[in-house]
Interface confidence: low
């Protein structure tokens, strides 16, 4: 009498999520009498997938008519595969009894499920940073299988190299997640820049998924300040201009101080954008020279995006000149054209 063999011809089967899988199994003998059962996994914790005689298995059907008298084909068909179905499936022959006794198991067929990664989500830093600082962007994508995946970072089309990537978990799993953190050095020209995280996977047929983040949400470009005086007007009024240039974002408050006292406060709004995405703003202050006996110290104070104020001062010389000779009024810029370096980077 020939010894019973349980043959599972495929060592592994790979199926796309949503498709059906066929797991093949044949036996070489009709003896002993008893049912075939399919399990996922081995050992005491194995999961019953299909029982030839009893139970309800809505997604599993027998490929051949397993109830036919001389049937030796016990292959099964599993529909609507999900990543949770991944695992090793065993076709197991039992001898009829009370209870049935396991006789022999097939070698097992590993079912792997090809699942697409989710659209990459790129998140940037919680607080803005200024040019020359380095900020981190994180890209995450989930739910893919198999584990092999490629992730690349780009800034404005140029590939980045300063990043660290990990695929989780390290061991076998029904599906995987990828997380990558890239470090990007900001420049003043980055208001319109983008970082792109690109994920390539076997399920994407060469068409990678991309996630993007705008550097405009991560960058702060502090303003340049310049205070100048226009020529003295006939009515003894001096027009002093504070030019605030090349800043981003638009959130900015400007305060004029005369000899240390607040004269006027303005908020920037609805400004036109420069080509590089930054903004400019000009504010004027009229000073009546005849109302002052001594020199007037004017300060243009700018608070940008919640950062410490930047000051630029300017002296209007009135004491050395008769009021009627207003055109000879001298001006002195006591500020500097240097950028204010007190912006805090978190």
């Amino acid at each position: 009498e020939e010894e019973l063999q349980v043959i599972q011809p495929e060592k592994s089967v790979s199926v796309a999520a949503g498709d059906s899988a066929t797991l093949n199994c044949t036996v070489t003998s009709l003896i002993p009498v008893g049912p075939i059962q399919w399990f996922r996994g081995a050992g005491p914790g194995r999961e019953l997938i299909y029982h030839q005689k009893e139970g309800h298995f809505p997604r599993v059907t027998s490929v051949s008519e397993s109830t036919k008298r001389n049937n030796m084909d016990f292959s099964i068909h599993i529909s609507n595969i999900t990543p949770a179905d991944a695992g090793t499936y065993y076709c197991v022959k039992f001898r009829k009894g009370s209870p049935d006794v396991e006789v022999k198991s097939g070698a097992g067929t590993e079912l792997s499920v090809r699942a697409k990664p989710s659209a990459p989500v790129v998140s940037g830093p919680a607080v803005r940073a200024t040019a020359e600082h380095t900020v981190s962007f994180t890209c995450e994508s989930h739910g893919f299988s198999p584990r092999d995946i490629t992730l690349k970072w780009f800034k404005n089309g140029n590939e980045l190299s300063d990043f660290q990537t990990n695929v989780d978990p390290a061991g076998k799993s029904v599906s995987y997640s990828i997380r990558s953190t890239a470090r990007v050095v900001l420049t003043r020209r980055d208001v319109h820049s983008q970082v792109i995280c690109e994920v390539a996977h076997v399920t994407l047929q060469g068409d990678p998924l991309r996630g993007t983040a705008n550097l405009s949400e991560a960058i702060r470009v502090p303003p340049f300040l310049e205070v100048t005086q226009q020529s003295m007007r006939a009515d003894n009024q001096v027009n002093v201009t504070c030019q605030v240039t090349k800043f981003y974002p638009q959130r900015l408050q400007l305060t004029w101080l005369e000899n240390g006292n607040v004269s006027r406060t303005e908020m920037a709004s609805a400004l036109p954008e420069n080509k590089d995405g930054t903004y400019n703003w000009t504010s004027w202050l009229l000073v009546n020279v005849s109302a002052h006996r001594d020199d007037v110290k004017l300060t243009c104070q700018v608070e940008h995006d919640g950062q410490p104020a930047v000051n630029k001062s300017f002296s209007v010389k009135v004491s050395a000149h008769p009021k009627e000779q207003g055109s000879n009024t001298a001006a002195e810029n006591t500020g500097t054209n240097e950028r204010n370096h007190h912006h805090h980077h978190h």
Partner: antibody, heavy 126, light 107 residues
Framework: QVHLQQPGAELVKPGASVKLSCKAS????????INWVKQRPGQGLEWIGN????????NYNEKFKTKATLTVDKSSNTVYMQFSSLTSEDSAVYYC???????????????????WGQGTLVTVSA | DIQMTQTTSSLSASLGDRVTISCRAS??????LNWYQQKPDGTVKLLIY???TLHSGVPSRFSGSGSGTDYSLTISNLEQEDIATYFC?????????FGGGTKLEIK
Amino acid sequence: QVHLQQPGAELVKPGASVKLSCKASGYNFNIYWINWVKQRPGQGLEWIGNIYPSSISTNYNEKFKTKATLTVDKSSNTVYMQFSSLTSEDSAVYYCARSEGTYYGGRYEGDWFGYWGQGTLVTVSA
Amino acid sequence: DIQMTQTTSSLSASLGDRVTISCRASQDIRNYLNWYQQKPDGTVKLLIYFTSTLHSGVPSRFSGSGSGTDYSLTISNLEQEDIATYFCQQGNTLPWTFGGGTKLEIK
């Protein structure tokens, strides 16, 4: 090239603390984990913990959780390990080593130590 | 924690010999096994990572193999400069753990 610089020796009294340093150079300090490894005289190697300079994430071996504290000074590319309540059992050579494995923020793949410091000999003695 | 066992704590061999040092893990470490060399002066160097990948600058006479729980390091043609203690380390699961070491001496 990659270099991890450690002081040669520290002599400390029982019950005191010691702060060991590991100064890194020759690579992007922020994106590699730095590990600390203990070796008692004539014994094997024991992993204490590691720190990721960029995010200051840390992992500790349970055995050393109350004993070791890892910190980083990014401005000087230096990692520190503070060892507290010292006893004779803490007399050992302490190495720092750079991780080469691809893992980030608590998610792990295989990990190996590609570059090692020369080690600091800590002697605990009254 | 995963226990790493190097059953041979010391080994004597002659120059030119082929030497094999073994290491066993208490559970499957999926090839995340690394080998280090510690010279008598205490200097530690990585030799091999991920079971069989040679670290840059390591001579080709060193090789590694194994899978599951059993791994080995082989030196095909022993040289004087190979006199050292060799440690295995698993990089599969925190905390990272090392074998007790195998001290290689010249006969």
